[in-house]
């Protein structure tokens, strides 16, 4: 059996994963979600509108993507933030903007960060600002794993199908 | 043999690769284009130089990528912008930088934004600036669809093969 | 059985999975490396920890990824930089931050830049800063090619598995 007789460290480096055993070898799980523009102070992912989709077994659960079968996936997400200049009467405090893709698997009692991007913005007088963050990478995931996002700066999101999205596809 | 009969420079740019023997079903359309560095005030995509290529049916038409067959594609693009400090005599106006991948399809009478990134830059005295934008995602595309880009801030592009590019591959 | 006998923390990092019986044709070389957080003034890539892995022939050599077989690969990398405000007594000099994925191939006697991102940062008083850079694209690579990274601003890297990474997968 895979991994049997390996030392813990060999097992750790090997990280043998189940590969998709598919009756239809052409199944290619993929998903592309967009942020719901009607929800201004939250980030709700939708797959039933515009160019968003769920294919070959991807499913949504509590604003998370459910991994349809064990294997390696490329996971990606983008957000765009914007803000107006602060008013001269207001104090300009720095804004911490961050976006993270997280994995929740009951193996762990917490969400594991997979992808993180961060930015400090210092709004100035008469100076509107815009900032984009994108990231993506390949991860070994297990059937039923949950992929979700966490964002700092949600009120500043520019919610449109081409600016705020989250997706994954099996390799 | 790959590369035989090519001039050294053609071999260097084409880098014809040994392809593993593939049945037709394993055709994997892919393209990687780079911004033509000889065109300073426009963004013209090239596939016949450096590490750029068109494979398995992708083609260029009117500076757009033509989708060779219907399916899901990962589409990506990057730009890098730079600028010098403004001169003390000049007024510093904010610069709006943006890069967008667009879809033109017979289904719609207009260009649909697929991927958008944006940035406001405020040039300062003695302060050269640099900014990178990248994005990519999976989309369901139809044979004959056209993928193009629109960029605000073209005069500020840092045109090199590793900084300004546009590509796609079938999943 | 996978994971049996591992401590919870070893199991957490190992995430040993059963691999199913695969025909040779379904091999999918993939790699995801993370920056070693114990090395603060260098960027050393690791594949034997957290969610990093080498699959189906990828290997590490001199901090480079070795391409296991000729073909088209999607190559990606991310870095996150951070810094504190400069002290009032110090002079604030601009910081050039850059991250590049490079190819070293026996075809060329030098490192070829594949992916480059750049940023100028101007630290201010009382102003900590954060900046993320990501890029990825498809390239035709040859068995034995070496993929490496070069980074300007290494002392400012935020070294964690979700912020600094480098990977590739065969298409």
């Amino acid at each position: 059996l895979p991994g049997v007789g390996l030392t813990p460290s060999a097992a750790q480096t090997a990280r043998q994963h189940p590969k998709m055993h598919l009756a239809h070898s052409t199944l290619k799980p993929a998903a592309h979600l967009i942020g719901d523009p009607s929800k201004q102070n939250s980030l709700l992912w939708r797959a039933n509108t515009d160019r968003a989709f769920l294919q070959d077994g991807f499913s949504l659960s509590n604003n998370s993507l459910l991994v349809p079968t064990s294997g390696i996936y490329f996971v990606y997400s983008q957000v765009v933030f914007s803000g107006k200049a602060y008013s001269p009467k207001a104090t300009s405090s720095p804004l911490y903007l961050a976006h993270e893709v997280q994995l929740f698997s009951s193996q762990y009692p917490f969400h594991v960060p997979l992808l993180s991007s961060q930015k400090m913005v210092y709004p100035g007088l008469q100076e509107p600002w815009l900032h984009s963050m994108y990231h993506g990478a390949a991860f070994q995931l297990t059937q039923g794993d949950q992929l979700s996002t966490h964002t700092d700066g949600i009120p500043h999101l520019v919610l449109s199908p081409s600016t705020v999205f989250f997706g994954a596809f099996a390799l | 043999l790959p590369g035989v009969g090519l001039t050294p420079s053609a071999a260097q740019t084409a880098r014809q690769h040994p392809k593993m023997h593939l049945a037709h079903s394993t055709l994997k359309p892919a393209a990687h284009l780079i911004g033509d560095p000889s065109k300073q005030n426009s963004l013209l995509w090239r596939a016949n130089t450096d590490r750029a290529f068109l494979q398995d049916g992708f083609s260029l038409s009117n500076n757009s990528l033509l989708v060779p067959t219907s399916g899901i594609y990962f589409v990506y693009s990057q730009v890098v912008f730079s600028g010098k400090a403004y001169s003390p005599k000049a007024t510093s106006s904010p610069l709006y930088l943006a890069h967008e991948v667009q879809l033109f399809s017979s289904q719609y009478p207009f260009h649909v934004p697929l991927l958008s990134s944006q940035k406001m830059v405020y040039p300062g005295l003695q302060e050269p600036w640099l900014h990178s934008m990248y994005h990519g995602a999976a989309f369901q595309l139809t044979q004959g669809d056209q993928l193009s880009t629109h960029t605000d801030g073209i005069p500020h592009l840092v045109l090199s093969p590793s900084t300004v590019f546009f590509g796609a591959f079938a999943l | 059985l996978p994971g049996v006998g591992l401590t919870p923390s070893a199991a957490q990092t190992a995430r040993q999975h059963p691999k199913m019986h695969l025909a040779h044709s379904t091999l999918k070389p993939a790699a995801h490396l993370i920056g070693d957080p114990s090395k603060q003034n260098s960027l050393l890539w690791r594949a034997n920890t957290d969610r990093a892995f080498l699959q189906d022939g990828f290997s590490l050599s001199n901090n480079s990824l070795l391409v296991p077989t000729s073909g088209i690969y999607f190559v990606y990398s991310q870095v996150v930089f951070s810094g504190k405000a400069y002290s009032p007594k110090a002079t604030s000099s601009p910081l050039y931050l850059a991250h590049e994925v490079q190819l070293f191939s026996s075809q060329y006697p030098f490192h070829v830049p594949l992916l480059s991102s750049q940023k100028m940062v101007y630290p201010g008083l009382q102003e900590p800063w954060l900046h993320s850079m990501y890029h990825g694209a498809a390239f035709q690579l040859t068995q034995g090619d070496q993929l490496s990274t070069h980074t300007d601003g290494i002392p400012h890297l935020v070294l964690s598995p979700s912020t600094v990474f480098f990977g590739a997968f065969a298409l």
């Epitope: 070959d56 077994g57 499913s59 079968t69 | - | 059985l1």
Partner: antibody
Framework: EVQLVESGGGLVQPGGSLRLSCAAS????????IHWVRQAPGKGLEWVGY????????NYNEKFKGRATISSDKSKNTAYLQMNSLRAEDTAVYYC???????????WGQGTLVTVSS | DIQMTQSPSSLSASVGDRVTITCRAS??????VAWYQQKPGKAPKLQIY???HRYTGVPSRFSGSGSGTDFTLTISSLQPEDFATYYC?????????FGQGTKVEIK
């Protein structure tokens, strides 16, 4: 050949508990989740939740959260459904199912009938 | 939760007939719908997934279509072994939910 065999059904008093078993064979047990789905007499199908035997990951239908616990034992290639505080409306045939892709119930056991009655 | 409403709840048909069963989702579910066949005293069997893809071993007379909220299962030429109850299921979001069933009986 994939086989799933449920057991543990029978008559249960209202307020009581049940523990159903699902013995799996014919595939690598840790490579797929096990779902539980129930069907009340003459009614439709209702998804209860799933467990991944590899990492003990679970996901429940909110309707059953707090009352249902799905678990598995890798050494026995067996999944379990524990349900507490049973009511008459929990009377149903309980099926375990193994998917191909996560939400597609491709392989089913024969079902086991649970009757909640005093 | 997403409600799946099937119609009709039952129908009578003869061998060789073309039979159509419809399923409506309470909100758009893209193409994330599966269909199952169940015979009395037996477990359900997966027939169609992702609205229109036949599962392994399912005869070509079975086809599915639809996207958004409206979906259809069609049996082009009913065979004796097709008399059963058919359920649709949305696999767009949890909790995955089923329709109440359509019983196909012999006329």
């Amino acid at each position: 050949e994939v086989q799933l065999v449920e057991s543990g059904g029978g008559l249960v008093q209202p307020g009581g508990s049940l523990r159903l078993s699902c013995a799996a064979s014919g595939y690598t047990f840790t490579s797929y989740v096990i779902h539980w789905v129930r069907q009340a007499p003459g009614k439709g199908l209702e998804w209860v939740g799933y467990n991944n035997p590899y990492n003990d990951g679970t996901n429940y239908n909110e309707k059953f959260k707090g009352r249902a616990t799905i678990s598995s034992d890798k050494s026995k290639n067996t999944a379990y459904l524990q349900m507490n505080s049973l009511r008459a409306e929990d009377t149903a045939v309980y099926y375990c199912s193994r998917p191909t892709m996560l939400p597609w119930f491709a392989y089913w056991g024969q079902g086991t009938l649970v009757t909640v009655s005093s | 939760d997403i409600q799946m409403t099937q119609s009709p709840s039952s129908l009578s048909a003869s061998v060789g007939d073309r039979v159509t069963i419809t399923c409506r989702a309470s909100q758009a579910v893209s193409s994330a719908v599966a269909w199952y066949q169940q015979k009395p005293g037996k477990a359900p069997k997966l027939q169609i997934y992702s609205a229109s893809h036949r599962y392994t071993g399912v005869p070509s007379r079975f086809s599915g279509s639809g996207s958004g909220t409206d979906f259809t299962l069609t049996i082009s030429s009913l065979q004796p072994e097709d008399f059963a109850t058919y359920y649709c299921q949305q696999h767009y979001s949890t909790p995955w939910t089923f329709g109440q069933g359509t019983k196909v009986e012999i006329k």
